[in-house]
């Protein structure tokens, strides 16, 4: 699988999942949010050569179509699989609230 | 909706259902499909621009972090939303078969 | 349902040749592809060969050292690889794609060393 536990493990060009950490304050401009600061959002980048982990039979037509017309521009593109949510504490007023945003942290990828 | 009324209809460098056409002997070296001899794949491509048709809460961030944050490398990319499915015709020795084929035909795309 | 088996893995000096067969058991029809893929200790398994009714295709890598070639009347494949290079060592998987749905075979060890 494209997934943290392969992909942060080893030097792969081909399409992984690639840790990203977003500030918050410094890179959303966001003051908000309580808690946590920031968090590892990550995000899929990479070629999706040869029938890379295709996700739908549509990209696995495309993928082999790619494969056997290397001139050809349509290609499948590295994107995320399984996502998991993120717990958030922040202020309406005076009063903290808890939200789980979902589908905010990118565990695995696929090419699509 | 980045979909073939829309894109097929206009100039849109952005994120948007392109046609492709593929030819099952010429392009893929199928001698096996009876009907159709070919048919419109499609495909997605173009930059996917802060919100355009953001498809997760991760790719809203990540489409928020890519704009306010120019020079980073991390931004959605431009992917099947809906696909629909194909009916063919092939043999097997003598008999004929019909099979649909699911998520064989992009309709729209989306930025994931 | 589709059953493959590889056979012809082992161990080969540098510069040696090994060919690679695999057979097809079941009900086989609508073939998108039949390919070989490897996998190299801690890495993705990626393709070698692929090979459609009258197209094959071949990673850059082993272009010119491989030839793939199909039996579709005894439904098979094989895999000739010759100047084989320590790099070529790997797991090689057997792969028939049936109108979207891969099958795999549980693989043969190809080592070259010397």
């Known amino acids: 699988a494209l997934d943290t536990n392969y992909c942060f493990r080893n030097l792969e060009e081909n399409c992984c999942v690639r840790p990203l950490y977003i500030d918050f304050r410094q890179d959303l401009g966001w003051k908000w949010v309580h808690e946590p600061k920031g968090y590892y959002a990550n995000f899929c980048s990479g070629p999706c050569p040869y029938l890379r982990s295709a996700d739908t039979t549509h990209s696995t037509v495309l993928g082999l179509y790619n494969t056997l017309n290397p001139e050809a521009s349509a290609s499948p593109c590295c994107v995320p699989q399984d996502l998991e949510p993120l717990t958030i504490l922040y202020y309406v007023g005076r009063t903290p609230k808890v939200e789980q945003l979902s589908n905010m942290v990118v565990k695995s990828c696929k090419c699509s | 909706a980045l979909d073939t009324n829309y894109c097929f209809r206009n100039l849109e460098e952005n994120c948007c259902v392109r046609p492709l056409y593929i030819d099952f002997r010429q392009d893929l070296g199928w001698k096996w499909v009876h009907e159709p001899k070919g048919y419109y794949a499609n495909f997605c491509s173009g930059p996917c621009p802060y919100l355009r048709s953001a498809d997760t809460t991760h790719s809203t961030v990540l489409g928020l972090y890519n704009t306010l944050n120019p020079e980073a490398s991390a931004s959605p990319c431009c992917v099947p939303q809906d696909l629909e499915p194909l009916t063919i015709l092939y043999y097997v020795g003598r008999t004929p078969k019909v099979e649909q084929l699911s998520n064989m035909v992009v309709k729209s795309c989306k930025c994931s | 349902q589709v059953q493959l088996v590889e056979s012809g893995g082992g161990l080969v000096q540098p510069g040696g040749s090994l060919r690679l067969s695999c057979a097809a058991s079941?009900?086989?029809?609508?073939?998108?592809?039949m390919g070989w893929f490897r996998q190299a200790p801690g890495k993705q398994r990626e393709m070698v060969a692929i090979?459609?009714?009258?197209?094959?295709s071949y990673v850059d890598s082993v272009k010119g050292r491989f030839t793939i070639s199909r039996d579709n009347a005894k439904n098979t494949l094989a895999l000739q690889m010759n100047s084989l290079k320590p790099e070529d060592t790997a797991v090689y998987f057997c792969?028939?794609?049936?109108?979207?749905?891969?099958?795999w075979g549980p693989g043969t060890q190809v080592t070259v060393s010397s």
């Open positions: 079941g009900s086989i029809f609508g073939v998108f592809y």
């Open positions: 792969n028939l794609n049936q109108l979207g749905t891969d099958y």
């Open positions: 090979s459609t009714d009258d197209r094959t």
